[in-house]
């Protein structure tokens, strides 16, 4: 009796696990077993698909085949027994495209009202990921285990830290991976559950600020408690994108190690240009708090973000306001190379009654003015990164008299 | 799979020296903290105190630091623990052991012991 | 430094009962709490992490309990080779410290 070639042949690939399924064709036949051959584009023959010989199931892997996961292979499969099937080919494709992403590893931290999460992809040093490593984000879903409400968190990244949970509450959760560059969502990992601590004697610092002075940083946060000491840690944002990255290492600030205060200052060289997280934690010598959290912190914003520099040109019922760069030490305009928006506060020199005027030109009318009329203006600059959300200080308040009454224009 | 293989057993006299080392592999070495514990015959364990491999940033037991000196060889994955001033009470069995992982928020549990080394501090 | 404490300090059982080991801080440590397994000439094997969770690898009759001051190690059916020493570590606060050990003997 012939023996009739295997048909639907599936091919499954989970970042470096590939696995080939397929169906009998004839399930009457006993003791068959198959075999695959493989050829890759522009090549004439084929090769003995290691790892699919002479299989009695209908499953094989074909993980260790070191092949370029971006190059086009066709697969070719027959049962055997005393004579051979015909050959049935499968449709050729590119390991990369038919690979799916699959499940992170993830690892959990608790505290009393919040659960820091680690995930690393599955696969470590995955071939099929190599070029794609750093291009990862996550998504998760989140629930109470004893109401099973799901929360959705969408473009997270290695390191990603959950607030405003209960003490001693088991949370579960899910992860899965997604690379965006190649529309591919992955698998879920497996559930995992962590139950919140009890809630801490000690709460994390509140309200971190960093702000310039002279040559110095200076970092204020607020306390519930006094007789505290304190210690400030920070790390280089990007590097929450990729914490298999050796660098990735909350690090001590020196002048910040031990504090009494609630601040502490430190000069501007401690840190390069760029963007860092910064966060806090208290200690009364027996217990020591949870961390804060995190503030990003962007020396190019904060050692320039100054007060915005203005003139005003005054008529009769408006001033016109025209805002020009900051002035560093030196008289030197300073480069500000991100988007900015301005506040203009302007009020009767008379009265405390304050308007307001949010602007992103630099050209501002503030409108409905009395003619001669002593008013004054002060105006502060802000980032439109909403992360980032840093604000200058006012500028000095200048005042100005509007011109009589037929000179609006 | 992951591995911590120390040095063998030592003898040393009173007021001597002894190093220890614990050689890493199975993992990425940079990446996790390295503990020493250590185990006085008969008795419980005492955590000695740690090292990060990626930039050697050390934490230790106030009992044990000015005695102790933690190092690292990157280059061999190994973890090197230095002893000084021996006395007789610091006859124990030194485990090397790994910690979490640097990224991680907090301290983390010893997942993996080396098979220890005995040291017999005898006059 | 945080002291734990550890209850019973030794404890004879037969095979197929259920043990409970008791562990208290002398602080608040926040499940940062690790149970170890040791057998005489070997190096301690870690069973449990954040009190609760079992280590990959370890039986499901190993389960940990317990928050804030109080811990507990249960076995839920002995066996013959859980005949070891059992010890609880905080992991809270530097210096880490151990419990004193609990010898768990055969009956």
């Known amino acids: 009796k012939n023996l009739k070639s295997p048909q639907k042949v599936e091919v499954d690939i989970i970042d470096d696990n590939f696995i080939l399924r397929w169906n009998r064709s004839d399930e009457s036949v006993g003791n068959v077993t198959f075999s695959f051959d493989y050829q890759k584009t522009g090549m004439d023959n084929w090769i003995k698909l290691s790892g699919c010989q002479n299989i009695t199931s209908t499953k094989c892997n074909f993980s260790s085949l070191k092949l370029n996961v971006y190059e086009e292979i066709k697969l070719r499969i027959r049962a055997e027994k005393e004579n051979t099937s015909s050959w049935y080919e499968v449709d050729s494709f590119t390991p990369f495209r038919k690979a799916q992403i699959g499940p992170p590893e993830v690892h959990l931290e608790a505290e009393d009202k919040a659960i820091v999460i680690h995930i690393s992809p599955g696969t470590k040093d995955s071939v099929m990921w190599a070029l794609d490593g750093l291009s990862f984000t996550y998504s998760l879903v989140i629930w109470k285990n004893s109401s099973g409400v799901e929360e959705r968190i969408e473009n997270i990244y290695s390191r990603h830290k959950i607030y405003k949970l209960s003490p001693e509450t088991t949370y579960c959760l899910k992860v899965k991976a997604a690379l965006l560059t190649s529309w591919k969502i992955g698998v879920y990992s497996p559930v995992h559950c962590i139950k919140t601590t009890v809630e801490n004697e000690l709460p994390p610092p509140e309200n971190i600020e960093v702000s310039v002075q002279n040559q110095n940083y200076v970092l204020k946060w607020d306390y519930t408690y006094a007789n505290m000491t304190f210690q400030v840690q920070w790390l280089h944002a990007f590097l929450k994108r990729n914490p298999g990255n050796h660098l990735y290492k909350w690090k001590q600030i020196p002048d910040c190690e031990n504090v009494k205060t609630t601040q502490c200052v430190f000069p501007q060289n401690v840190f390069q240009k760029g963007i860092y997280l910064l966060r806090v934690q208290a200690s009364d010598g027996n217990n020591t708090s949870f961390w804060s959290e995190e503030i990003k912190f962007d020396t190019e914003i904060q050692a320039f973000l100054l007060p915005p520099v203005f003139n005003i040109r005054s008529l009769s019922d408006s001033f016109h306001i025209y805002i020009g760069a900051p002035k560093q030490s030196g008289n030197t305009p300073v480069i500000q190379d991100y988007p900015l928006i301005y506040e203009i506060i302007f009020w009767e020199n008379t009265s405390n009654a304050e308007r307001k005027i949010i602007e992103k030109k630099t050209d501002v009318t503030v409108p409905n003015l009395k003619p001669l009329t002593v008013y004054c203006v002060k105006a502060r600059a802000h980032t439109m990164d909403e992360k980032l959300n840093k604000s200058s200080v006012f500028s000095d308040a200048v005042c100005e008299k509007t011109k009589p009454g037929n000179t609006s224009k | 799979q992951v591995q911590l293989v120390q040095s063998g057993a030592e003898v040393k006299k009173p007021g001597a020296s002894v190093k220890v080392s614990c050689k890493a592999s199975?993992?990425?070495?940079?990446?996790?903290?390295m503990n020493w514990v250590r185990q006085a015959p008969g008795q419980g364990l005492e955590w000695m105190g740690k090292?990060?491999?990626?930039?050697?940033?050390?934490h230790f037991n106030q009992k044990f630091r000015d005695r102790v000196t933690l190092t690292v060889d990157k280059s061999t994955s190994t973890v090197y623990m230095e002893l000084s001033s021996l006395r007789s009470e610091d006859t124990a069995v030194y485990y090397c052991?790994?910690?979490?992982?640097?990224?991680?928020?907090?301290?983390?549990?010893?997942?993996?012991w080396g098979q220890g080394t005995l040291v017999t501090v005898s006059s | 430094d945080i002291q734990m404490t550890q209850s019973p300090s030794s404890l004879s059982a037969s095979v197929g009962d259920r043990v409970t080991i008791t562990c208290k801080s002398s602080?608040?440590?926040?499940?940062?709490l690790a149970w170890y397994q040791q057998k005489p000439g070997k190096a301690p094997k870690l069973l449990i992490y954040?009190?609760?969770t079992l280590e990959s690898g370890v039986p499901s009759r190993f389960s940990g309990s317990g928050s804030g001051k109080d811990y507990t190690l249960t076995i839920s059916s002995l066996q013959p080779e859980d005949f070891a020493t059992y010890y609880c570590?905080?992991?809270?606060?530097?210096?880490?410290?151990f419990g004193q050990g609990t010898k768990l003997e055969i009956k």
């Open positions: 052991a790994r910690g979490g992982r640097i990224s991680f928020d907090y301290d983390a549990a010893l997942d993996y």
């Open positions: 199975g993992y990425t070495f940079t990446s996790y903290w």
């Open positions: 090292i990060d491999p990626s930039d050697s940033e050390t």
């Open positions: 602080e608040v440590i926040y499940n940062r």
């Open positions: 954040g009190a609760t």
């Open positions: 570590q905080q992991y809270w606060n530097k210096p880490f410290t």
